[in-house]
Amino acid sequence: KSSNEATNITPKHNMKAFLDELKAENIKKFLYNFTQIPHLAGTEQNFQLAKQIQSQWKEFGLDSVELAHYDVLLSYPNKTHPNYISIINEDGNEIFNTSLFEPPPPGYENVSDIVPPFSAFSPQGMPEGDLVYVNYARTEDFFKLERDMKINCSGKIVIARYGKVFRGNKVKNAQLAGAKGVILYSDPADYFAPGVKSYPDGWNLPGGGVQRGNILNLNGAGDPLTPGYPANEYAYRRGIAEAVGLPSIPVHPIGYYDAQKLLEKMGGSAPPDSSWRGSLKVPYNVGPGFTGNFSTQKVKMHIHSTNEVTRIYNVIGTLRGAVEPDRYVILGGHRDSWVFGGIDPQSGAAVVHEIVRSFGTLKKEGWRPRRTILFASWDAEEFGLLGSTEWAEENSRLLQERGVAYINADSSIEGNYTLRVDCTPLMYSLVHNLTKELKSPDEGFEGKSLYESWTKKSPSPEFSGMPRISKLGSGNDFEVFFQRLGIASGRARYTKNWETNKFSGYPLYHSVYETYELVEKFYDPMFKYHLTVAQVRGGMVFELANSIVLPFDCRDYAVVLRKYADKIYSISMKHPQEMKTYSVSFDSLFSAVKNFTEIASKFSERLQDFDKSNPIVLRMMNDQLMFLERAFIDPLGLPDRPFYRHVIYAPSSHNKYAGESFPGIYDALFDIESKVDPSKAWGEVKRQIYVAAFTVQAAAETLSEVA
């Protein structure tokens, strides 16, 4: 309803005109164009693509399109000294070596500059020792090993399967356990869906396929050498020893054919339970070391990658707002890929390209959005969200004053089953209303709305008749905007059926087999799911930039705050005796949530009734909505994580990809029964309850009548 009420909107130039201009065929064409060669961050090929996108966005009609460059720490394998892992015999002879590259997919045999599989930012080293299998290398896996099984990983090389949690958390956990090296592998239990063929005959991971990826623990810092500040021409850079988040032990990824050779010889303890077994024909013994006949053999890693300060390029396009040019709605996604980027990121970049083209078409016909829209093609996302973070650090003062919303646009698909949305509660109603107006692309839902198919296939666990919307975690470019700056953020993509497909991510994630053909043959031949994602992302941007009253509903924040308070309280109540002993009370938090609920309700009533023709009052009300997300930011940040400043949400300390609610309290309570000083530990719980209660109350007050 709100869009075509905007002052400069004629009936022709409404949301429908924007959506109708989006074409599946264009997205397909753009995806093909973006995926013919690798676009690794820091390479000439990715610089050329940045310039191409800059040129095309200008042609599409944006007001300005600039490149923003930064010199950041990246990591590459040594071209003449490849990384690999060996099994060595008692004489030190290498009797087995893992492969040096993935067999290239058909049609790509002669492509140069395919970076071999590596773990970005691994230090150099050639550790050798006994192997310990650590399952997914999650916090709970190491608890099981160390506490229950009494297995010591100190001085061992650990082998962990990919999946469940961000790989950087796995490496951090292994380091803390005293390991001297980490081997990461893709188990078919997680990366091979039953009944589907391996690429190129299907979308499953072949045995020689390997997942690349960074293994940093940046906690939102951006460039490891310039935390908090842009990596510009006059930047002061830390020494490598003081760099943020770098791993201290060598790490290397392998495929399941190579993993089979390492795991089949494992001896020592049997796996503790079936959850430690994958799908390979190996015992999944934990170790340490190899069994009987092979007990004198060891594993040796050979890692020679180098960290290098390298120039990266963001593309920033501007479509100036007609009424509120100083209010920014941002649509951003990354451009850099590990290899061809068939899904990650180019399925997202192609959608952004088509959204820009559609907005440009409207602008050429005389239309402008109410608010300014910024479009971003980020660089070096794969190396730690570096491009987006450096740009946000450089522009933080503008963003914190003018940033209305950030919509992320990485991979448009990770499956073709249903929609998946993660966003701030402020956007729930926007997403609901928008998806009710869009057609579902799903088979069996012809003529039905996207909302209907999404709700049917992915129902909310709390509210019947509504779809699941998840918390924002991290591992993508919205991180700096949401977790550091407190700008309302959201993301949407098409996903798999999580019920039937238990594998992690999509099987060919970050492998050489993530090609255009993977998408065109197996995931989305008609590009109808891409088009739907373009409509959702583009539609959200359109509404956020164009509606007279910002499409945020603060009452939805009140609902989730109560849910999160209940959840953290019940976690704490697992320790009733200690809560009594140390006088731990959640009363202040529940009181603050109650106040927030009441004030949000009153604010919503005023929002319905105020005089929208009064630009000052309109701006005032919109500012209260815009700054609500900002009000959840604690300038001091979370303990030991200064760039995670949102008090309601943060990436889980155990899995960067997952969002945690009331993270300060959650972390203070985590494993509290094992703390050496319970008094101090419970004191920190109380402090975190205080911080959370204060923040919720302070946020509530920003919604009160101003005078």
Epitope: G207, G208, Y257, K261, R277, S279, L280, K281, P283
Partner: antibody, heavy 120, light 111 residues
Framework: QVQLVQSGAEVKKPGASVKVSCKAS????????INWLRQAPGQGLEWMGG????????NYNENFKGRVTLTIDKSTSTAYMELSSLRSEDTAVYFC?????????????WGQGTLVTVSS | DIVMTQSPLSLPVTPGEPASISCRSS???????????LHWYLQKPGQSPQLLIY???NRFSGVPDRFSGSGSGTDFTLKISRVEAEDVGVYYC????????FGGGTKVEIK
């Protein structure tokens, strides 16, 4: 496509040795074990042993231990089976077969077979 | 070693009719990882064996869907829903959970 090509038929005297080759192509040789099996005239299949080209590790059927030796030449992607102290009951067709890795873990590609005749 | 026992030894069939072959192992074929590595091969006259079914019930590439496998633990069955002339040959069950062993074979011939 995956191919296993075996050497030609052999006639041997009792007490002699025979060495059969199996040249692999169409896949990464080091990823897949090679099994050797035999089939006596009108009989079923009998597994003799297997070798892993990746590390040279071998497994032998107890019935053949000491008489069979499996080797590989990575440079030519060739596997070899040598059977010594031949006797007339060793007359059989000898097959090499690739041990399919995940998800098969079955012998998914076979050589054409090599007839070895042991006769005085 | 695991002993694999197939029945019947010989199976005369009429084209278009179904056929069923049974295979029993001397001990469980369930691997510690939960998978059962029981496979079926067909050796056509004068040819090398070829893989038909792997891990009990999965058809290998190019195998017609008239072939199906089932069973668990120690008892397994291969079924041909409608026998065709080209299906003649000797069918072997085999296990690779332990040291590989084969059944004695079932000769399928047209009546």
């Amino acid at each position: 496509q995956v191919q296993l090509v075996q050497s030609g038929a052999e006639v041997k005297k009792p007490g002699a040795s025979v060495k059969v080759s199996c040249k692999a192509s169409g896949y990464t040789f080091t990823y897949f074990d090679i099994n050797w099996l035999r089939q006596a005239p009108g009989q079923g299949l009998e597994w003799m042993g297997g070798i892993s080209p990746g590390d040279g590790n071998t497994n032998y059927n107890e019935n053949f231990k000491g008489r069979v030796t499996l080797t590989i030449d990575k440079s030519t992607s060739t596997a070899y089976m040598e059977l010594s102290s031949l006797r007339s009951e060793d007359t059989a067709v000898y097959f090499c077969a690739r041990d399919g890795n995940f998800p098969y873990y079955a012998m998914d590609s076979w050589g054409q077979g090599t007839l070895v005749t042991v006769s005085s | 070693d695991i002993v694999m026992t197939q029945s019947p030894l010989s199976l005369p069939v009429t084209p278009g009719e179904p056929a069923s072959i049974s295979c029993r192992s001397s001990q469980s074929l369930v691997h510690s990882n939960g998978q059962t590595y029981l496979h079926w091969y067909l050796q056509k006259p004068g040819q090398s064996p070829q893989l038909l079914i792997y891990t009990v019930s999965n058809r290998f590439s190019g195998v017609p869907d008239r072939f199906s496998g089932s069973g668990s633990g120690t008892d397994f069955t291969l079924k041909i829903s409608r026998v065709e002339a080209e299906d003649v040959g000797v069918y072997y069950c085999s296990q690779s959970t332990h040291v590989p062993t084969f059944g004695g074979g079932t000769k399928v011939e047209i009546k």
